[in-house]
Interface confidence: low
């Protein structure tokens, strides 16, 4: 019988224990400062900074800034101690500076829309550049009170790092105020203005009669014609044209916080809700060995997929880079980079009936816009912290 510890799978001095109960056949006991199923990535050093209510401590994207918390279950604030905001209009009202609140309905349950005075034009009637916002822009943590177009959505912190998702959309149309408010605004129904958040689309959602079926058949490798519509998520890409190798097609790398005990369900939920929301086929990509392209974050492979640079002080053996890791980690929540394939074959000028983002950059802007107006988080199984689009490349030539 082969000893699973024979290959010394544990890195950074971790000790290996063979166990039939683990998906890998072994468990690594990691030294302080390292984590993951093979101890292959560093645990972020949070010091005295503690993330409550299951929040995940992540290194700041800005060198020299303290670690930040990715909060779960609607909690917020630097330590995840701020309780979840009530659904809909409260009380207390989510609209600041005397803004009036009206309730909306959507995929994620009751939402809200604020009607704001001109002096405070953020989605929650925030005042960009308000007192206390100096120095908080671009620190990796979304400060809702500092988020608005005037302050580039807290320097991109509230819009997935995109300073202005509506760049190119005429400012006088104020489409960022009207985006995804449940009403069609024809002046915003364009690529530049992000199709008014699809508020002009009919039908707006997959019909209840098809929804359960399409849910259960989503990206199962078989084209279900009844589910191959924009509102039903294009069957998770199962009906995409056969020409071209999907391995080299466009993709999105998403940095999300998920709970490993139910990771597969959450990955499924993430792919399907984003397919329905973006009206493009999305699925978790598999690598050449047939494994989900899901990588623990922080970690070299994850950072590579996000387009970041490697920390030169970070030592890692070659083996872990060849395999997705982290699906067996036992913490309550963890950061993962999920690489999703994207079927854009039904989008673009050749398909005027299917208004959807026809390149990954536009997808990023659309997601950033949703994040900016607070429409994204209620839909997802965990916080989405960053998105990195890949346009797709031609496969390398066979070398004989």
């Amino acid at each position: 019988e082969i000893d699973p510890c024979h290959s010394q799978p544990c890195f950074h001095g971790g000790t290996c224990e063979a166990t039939a109960g683990s998906p890998l056949g072994f468990i690594c006991h990691c030294p302080k400062g390292f984590e993951g199923p093979t101890c292959s990535h560093r645990a972020p050093s949070c010091g005295f900074h503690h993330c409550h209510h299951g929040g995940l401590c992540l290194p700041s994207p800005k060198p020299g800034f303290p670690p930040r918390c990715a909060c779960l279950s609607g909690y917020g604030g630097p330590d995840c101690l701020t309780p979840p905001a009530p659904k809909g209009c409260g009380p207390p009202s989510p609209c600041l500076y005397n803004g009036s609140c009206s309730e909306t309905t959507g995929l994620g349950g009751p939402g809200f829309r604020c009607s704001c005075p001109h002096s405070s034009p953020g989605p929650r009637c925030q005042k960009p550049g308000a007192k206390g916002c100096e120095g908080r822009s671009g620190d990796g943590a979304c400060d809702a009170g500092c988020s608005g177009p005037g302050g580039n959505w807290d320097g991109g912190d509230c819009s997935l790092g995109v300073p202005d998702p509506w760049k190119g959309c005429p400012s006088h149309s104020r489409c960022w105020l009207l985006f995804r408010d449940g009403q069609c605004h024809p002046q915003c129904d364009s690529e530049e203005c992000l199709f008014d958040g699809y508020d002009c689309e009919t039908p707006p959602a997959c019909t209840p009669a098809y929804d359960q079926y399409c849910h259960d058949h989503f990206h199962n490798g078989h084209c279900e014609k009844g589910c191959n519509t924009a509102e039903c998520g294009w069957d998770g890409g199962d009906c995409r044209p056969e020409d071209g190798d999907p391995e080299w097609g466009p993709s999105l790398a998403l940095l999300v916080v998920l709970s490993p005990p139910a990771l597969d369900q959450q990955l499924f939920a993430l792919a399907r809700v984003l397919s329905l929301t973006l009206r493009v086929g999305l699925w978790v990509r598999k690598d050449r060995d047939g494994r989900d392209m899901v990588y623990p974050y922080p970690g070299a492979r994850a950072e590579e997929k996000l387009g970041g640079t490697r920390d030169p002080t970070y030592q890692e053996r070659a083996a872990p880079q060849t395999q997705p890791l982290g699906k067996e980690t036992d913490s309550l929540s963890a950061g993962f980079v999920v690489v999703m394939g994207v079927d854009l074959s039904r989008c673009g000028p050749d398909h005027p009936a299917s208004r959807c983002p026809w390149d990954p950059g536009l997808l990023l802007r659309f997601l950033a816009a949703m994040a900016a107006v607070g429409a994204l988080e209620p839909l997802l199984p965990g916080p989405l912290l960053a998105v990195h689009p890949h346009a797709g490349t031609a496969p390398p030539a066979n070398q004989l």
């Epitope: 098809y210 199962n220 009844g226």
Partner: antibody, heavy 115, light 107 residues
Framework: EVQLVESGGGLVQPGGSLRLSCAAS????????MSWVRQAPGKGLELVST????????YYANSVKGRFTISRDNSKNTLYLQMGSLRAEDMAVYYC????????WGQGTLVTVSS | DIQMTQSPSSLSASVGDRVTITCKAS??????VAWYQQKPGKVPKLLIY???TRHTGVPSRFSGSGSGTDFTLTISSLQPEDVATYYC?????????FGQGTKVEIK
């Protein structure tokens, strides 16, 4: 050729337990949702339970909820139904079937509940 | 739960006759409806799915139609081998439910 072969049926007393198995072949088992459907003698068809392709989501008919457990082992291409606290009304032929539009069925296994 | 009500519960027709079985859903199920044939002592066999798509190998005399709440299975020319019980089923939402069955016999 798609094949589904059930086993594990038999005579059991009220309150007893049984575990049904369904061995699948001829298709990529891990890509399909699977279900158990039953048919009481001389009666119609009733969906008992279903499970999605990776085992992450399950559904149970109200009549069996809390007593039956559906599971699958994709490495063995096998679907299971663990039945507990069996009642007289659970007596039926149990079929395993592939997917919601049940294109493929096993031959069925008879579960008899009697004292 | 969505109820699927079939009618008639049984019928007797001559060889060559056109036979129609209807199924009424208690609420809108789109076209997420399948029809099955079960011969005495045999396993159910899928005939139609998505309300009107014939399954592989099913003779062309079987056809399905309908959407929303009203569905029909038609056998254009009844054959002796069509003697069976026919069931409709909705798979629009859990729990997927079957009709009570329609028994077809030859006069």
């Amino acid at each position: 050729e798609v094949q589904l072969v059930e086993s594990g049926g038999g005579l059991v007393q009220p309150g007893g337990s049984l575990r049904l198995s369904c061995a699948a072949s001829g298709f990529t088992f891990s890509s399909y949702g699977m279900s158990w459907v039953r048919q009481a003698p001389g009666k119609g068809l009733e969906l008992v339970s279903t499970i999605n392709s990776n085992g992450g989501r399950t559904y149970y008919a109200n009549s069996v909820k809390g007593r039956f457990t559906i599971s699958r082992d994709n490495s063995k291409n096998t679907l299971y139904l663990q039945m507990g606290s069996l009642r007289a009304e659970d007596m039926a032929v149990y079929y395993c079937a592939r997917d919601q539009g049940f294109a493929y069925w096993g031959q069925g296994t008879l579960v008899t509940v009697s004292s | 739960d969505i109820q699927m009500t079939q009618s008639p519960s049984s019928l007797s027709a001559s060889v060559g006759d056109r036979v129609t079985i209807t199924c009424k859903a208690s609420q809108d199920v789109g076209t997420a409806v399948a029809w099955y044939q079960q011969k005495p002592g045999k396993v159910p066999k899928l005939l139609i799915y998505w309300a009107s798509t014939r399954h592989t190998g099913v003779p062309s005399r079987f056809s399905g139609s309908g959407s929303g709440t009203d569905f029909t299975l038609t056998i254009s020319s009844l054959q002796p081998e069509d003697v069976a019980t026919y069931y409709c089923q909705q798979y629009s939402s859990y729990p997927w439910t079957f009709g009570q069955g329609t028994k077809v016999e030859i006069k």
